[in-house]
Interface confidence: medium
């Protein structure tokens, strides 16, 4: 059998970093090792291209100002998966200044139903649902450097955590036959 | 504007850990911080339930021994997304002893086409395609502790990297109208 890697160690205490130790709001170096390369993660990699094309930020609410498209095969032959899908989605930039990466691209289904490939139109006989995936991020939170209850201005503790990120949509039979 | 977190630092040199420093093949503690909780990542969390139900391991080849199901609404009303989808998929356990986590659940589309919701049968007029997502993992590789070219037995260097993991399938219009 291959060797057991064991479970990650559990450290109860989090180090509190001063403003001086954190250059320009960056996370501590030991949490940002060379090879992590967060920009390789798809929800991060997509941000730059979305910003370049002027995609909207969060807080408009799901599907705000969106419309389930009428799908025309000749228009999507060369398109990406999210546009060719019969449960199409778009990407929205989610921003959180207390998270690294601060900006993530999250998927939003454009249709409640799915698109009938033959007619190109939405059908309520099927449902579009999000596919969620876990993403490892760094979270920062104010902390106290002197042991008191009050946070020290500009000081932060950091920890890694998994968050659920919608990465796309798939088309399913509804749970109810109604 | 929220503060810039900057890019992860780049460290050219990787520390080479001896067998004594690595208890039972575990990764170094600083790479397995408390809050990483890899077992929360979906491709990891699914492994235990898959093993419990006797799912097959890798290396049988994609779709080996699988079949595109006939979808019957009454049978999948309470099923999970991967079974209710008209581009259904199953999970396979991918094992790599030089990666942490060693075991990951990866999605495999069960159909080349998609399932016609009305007939329950596969149609070639549409394609099932994988949705890929990035997952941060630890990678270990043999290394030399004495500066020579030959690796020291039982010694490993570690780095983190993003790998592309199929997390589900979606149904798309084909790229070609043929």
């Amino acid at each position: 059998d291959p060797p057991s890697w064991g479970k990650p160690r559990s450290h109860r205490t989090l180090r509190c970093y001063s403003a001086e130790e954190l250059s320009h709001g960056q996370a501590p170096p030991h949490l940002l090792t060379r090879s992590a390369r967060w920009e390789q993660a798809l929800p991060v990699a997509l941000v730059a291209s979305l910003e370049a094309t002027g995609h909207r930020r969060q807080h408009e609410g799901p599907l705000a100002g969106t419309q389930c498209p009428v799908l025309r095969p000749e228009e999507v032959l060369e398109a990406d998966t999210h546009e060719r899908s019969i449960s199409p989605w778009r990407y929205r930039i989610d921003t959180d200044e207390n998270r690294y990466p601060q900006k993530l691209a999250v998927a939003e289904c454009l249709c409640r139903g799915c698109i009938n490939a033959k007619t190109g139109r939405e059908t309520a006989a099927l449902n579009s649902v999000q596919l969620l995936q876990s993403l490892l991020v760094l979270r920062r939170q104010p902390c106290s450097r002197d042991g008191t209850a009050d946070p020290t201005p500009g000081s932060f503790a950091f920890h890694t955590e998994f968050i659920r990120v919608p990465v796309g949509c798939t088309c399913v039979l509804p749970r109810s036959t109604q | 504007d929220p503060p810039s977190w900057g890019k992860p630092r780049s460290h050219r040199t990787l520390r080479c850990y001896s067998a004594e420093e690595l208890s039972h093949g575990q990764a170094p503690p600083h790479l397995l911080t408390r809050s990483a909780r890899w077992e929360q990542a979906l491709p990891v969390a699914l492994v235990a339930s898959l093993e419990a139900t006797g799912h097959r391991r890798q290396h049988e080849g994609p779709l080996a021994g699988t079949q595109c199901p006939v979808l019957r609404p009454e049978e999948v009303l309470e099923a999970d997304t991967h079974e209710r989808s008209i581009s259904p998929w199953r999970y396979r356990i991918d094992t790599d002893e030089n990666r942490y986590p060693q075991k990951l659940a990866v999605a495999e589309c069960l159909c080349r086409g998609c399932i016609n919701a009305k007939t329950g049968r596969e149609t070639a007029a549409l394609n099932s395609v994988q949705l890929l997502q990035s997952l941060l993992v630890l990678r270990r590789q043999p290394c030399s502790r004495d500066g020579t070219a030959d690796p020291t037995p039982g010694s490993f260097a570690f780095h983190t990297e993003f790998i592309r993991v199929p997390v589900g399938c979606t149904c798309v219009l084909p790229r070609s109208t043929q």
């Epitope: 389930c68 498209p69 009428v70 033959k118 007619t119 139109r121 939405e122 309520a124 006989a125 | -």
Partner: antibody
Framework: EVQLVQSGAEVKKPGESLKISCKGS????????IAWVRQMPGKGLEWMGF????????QYSPSFQGQVTISADKSISTAYLQWSSLKASDTAMYYC?????????????WGQGTLVTVSS | DIVLTQSPATLSLSPGERATLSCRAS??????LAWYQQKPGQAPRLLIY???SRATGIPARFSGSGSGTDFTLTISSLEPEDFAVYYC?????????FGQGTKVEIK
């Protein structure tokens, strides 16, 4: 009872505007496409376009694109067909019809029709 | 656009007789074909969809057959209320199109 009820007959002059309506009841109006179909005097049926009341997505027949506008108000379960400038050739019976659940363009419920007469 | 050609244009029959109506498509429409009945002063009514499936409430004397480009609507034994105009319609391609109609009249 599932039904579509259309507004009454209209007599208009060329160049005038017009908006006719189709109100659905007895089913989930928002989740079915509504089609508009034209039947000129003594002639056959011609599909004009669709609207999905849930989000007002539309699809037009190339023959009618730009000639008419299809809209809907989902809050009152009503679809509309309108002209900004009528022509004598618009004289016809106009039907609204419900597309079947799977959007295969089979019309399983029809309105009673609205007769539009355009004459100077 | 797909052109549907119906024949004959008029069919003169007596009650109790069998009526056979034809619809030919200019391109393959698979089984995505429907039949409608329209009586004078009324809206059309869906009879058959998917070439051979009877719509809700349609009597068993109405049946549809065919696939590809050639389709048939059969009325096994004409009732007085069956004399009307019948249209076929394809939904294989957008735009959906109708045939020009076949009138079934009393002989």
């Amino acid at each position: 009872e599932v039904q579509l009820v259309q507004s009454g007959a209209e007599v208009k002059k060329p160049g005038e505007s017009l908006k006719i309506s189709c109100k659905g009841s007895g089913y989930s109006f928002n989740n079915y496409w509504i089609a508009w179909v034209r039947q000129m005097p003594g002639k056959g049926l011609e599909w004009m376009g669709f609207i999905y009341p849930s989000n007002s997505a539309t699809q037009y027949s190339p023959s009618f694109q730009g000639q008419v506008t299809i809209s809907a108000d989902k809050s009152i379960s009503t679809a509309y067909l309108q002209w900004s400038s009528l022509k004598a050739s618009d004289t016809a019976m106009y039907y609204c019809a419900r597309d079947n659940e799977y959007s295969d363009s089979y019309f399983d419920v029809w309105g009673q029709g609205t007769l539009v007469t355009v004459s100077s | 656009d797909i052109v549907l050609t119906q024949s004959p244009a008029t069919l003169s029959l007596s009650p109790g007789e069998r009526a056979t109506l034809s619809c030919r498509a200019s391109q393959i429409v698979s089984s995505y074909l429907a039949w409608y009945q329209q009586k004078p002063g009324q809206a059309p009514r869906l009879l058959i969809y998917d070439a051979s499936s009877r719509a809700t409430g349609i009597p068993a004397r109405f049946s549809g057959s065919g696939s590809g480009t050639d389709f048939t609507l059969t009325i096994s034994s004409l009732e007085p209320e069956d004399f009307a105009v019948y249209y076929c319609q394809q939904s294989e391609q957008v735009p959906t199109t109708f045939g020009q109609g076949t009138k079934v009249e009393i002989k």
